[in-house]
């Protein structure tokens, strides 16, 4: 039975040309996290394997940085980066948990950032 829940940064906005940290946190389960994948719509951005580390897709290596923690940092943002992002937690024995974040990249220099998310 899957008892876990994923907390995310939710809906966030950032300024064009800037950076943003995408973060998720899995709680309420004792399942072992074996891998976390970060996806944008249908594209895989990065993999963080618990034992074998971070791997960034070659298509995104210039603009995506691992961390902090299991999070992902997007750099040099463009308006085309607006959209849904997913953190996919592969766990044992529970299976897969998915969290959703919506990022809006604004042209304005007064982009309003979502509340700062803290990992407990």
């Amino acid at each position: 039975m899957m008892t876990g829940t994923i907390e995310t940064t939710g809906n966030i906005s950032a300024e064009k040309g800037g950076s943003i940290i995408l973060q998720c946190h899995l709680s309420s389960t004792t399942a072992q996290v074996t891998q976390v994948n970060w996806e944008q719509q249908d594209q895989l951005l990065a993999i963080c394997n618990a034992d074998l580390g971070w791997h960034i897709s070659p298509s995104f290596k210039d603009r995506v940085a691992p961390g902090p923690g299991l999070g992902l940092t997007l750099q040099s943002l463009t308006v085309n980066d607006t959209g849904e992002y997913f953190c996919i937690y592969h766990t044992y024995p529970d299976g897969t948990y998915t969290g959703r974040i919506f990022l809006e990249v604004l042209e304005s220099s007064v982009a309003e950032h979502g509340a700062r998310f803290q990992i407990p």
Epitope: T34, L52, H90
Partner: antibody, heavy 119, light 107 residues
Framework: QVQLVESGGGVVQPGRSLRLDCKAS????????MSWVRQAPGKGLELVAT????????YYPDSVKGRFTISRDNSKNTLFLQMNSLRAEDTAVYYC????????????WGQGTLVTVSS | EIVMTQSPATLSLSPGERATLSCKAS??????VSWYQQKPGQAPRLLIY???TRATGIPARFSGSGSGTDYTLTISSLEPEDFAVYYC?????????FGQGTKVEIK
């Protein structure tokens, strides 16, 4: 250059135990996660254990979970695979392997060591 | 776990011919696929990772492509040393699983 050298294979009876070693050189062993991959005679490849760089995290597929234990001694640049309650279906060549730097794939492999489980 | 199915099991070709090897995943693996070559008595050798990136030292005649559940390894013109068994592997979810292999043999 990266070198991985396995040892410890041999013939063992079902139900018994065996420990495999993999001696690493040519890279900073303590900075890399490591894996064991096996290949039954004439068959395909199966990842059987992984361990992170400091030994604090491990992973096993269901086929070996509870019977195999991966560990490492970073001071000796050595990876281990302790195999208990061995079965005939564990007969295989066992390779230790490392991902390439920034490479999502096993770029470095040892020569393999054959484990035969037979009565 | 994700099952990787390779086809054909055996491919009989002559040197100089083009080889097309297929790997189908049981679910979308979003380009987290690598390919290996293995010759008898040897360890596997990494050829391709992230579906289409050639590993260090791999000749340009080897190329990978694909997305979703379908991936292809192409050898544009077979050299004598290319006759071997080829495996695909997915890294999208744990456990990272391999296909059963395609043997490329001399016709």
């Amino acid at each position: 250059q990266v070198q991985l050298v396995e040892s410890g294979g041999g013939v063992v009876q079902p139900g018994r135990s065996l420990r495999l070693d993999c001696k690493a050189s040519g890279f900073t062993f303590s900075s890399y996660g490591m894996s064991w991959v096996r290949q039954a005679p004439g068959k395909g490849l199966e990842l059987v254990a992984t361990i992170n760089s400091n030994g604090g995290s491990t992973y096993y597929p269901d086929s070996v979970k509870g019977r195999f234990t991966i560990s490492r001694d970073n001071s000796k640049n050595t990876l281990f695979l302790q195999m208990n309650s061995l079965r005939a279906e564990d007969t295989a060549v066992y390779y230790c392997a490392r991902l390439g730097t920034g490479t999502l794939g096993f770029a470095y492999w040892g020569q393999g060591t054959l484990v035969t489980v037979s009565s | 776990e994700i099952v990787m199915t390779q086809s054909p099991a055996t491919l009989s070709l002559s040197p100089g011919e083009r080889a097309t090897l297929s790997c189908k995943a049981s679910q979308d693996v979003k380009t987290a696929v690598s390919w290996y070559q293995q010759k008898p008595g040897q360890a596997p050798r990494l050829l391709i990772y992230w579906a289409s990136t050639r590993a260090t030292g791999i000749p340009a005649r080897f190329s990978g492509s694909g997305s979703g559940t379908d991936y292809t390894l192409t050898i544009s013109s077979l050299e004598p040393e290319d006759f071997a068994v080829y495996y695909c592997q997915q890294h999208y979810s744990t456990p990272w699983t391999f296909g059963q292999g395609t043997k490329v043999e001399i016709k």
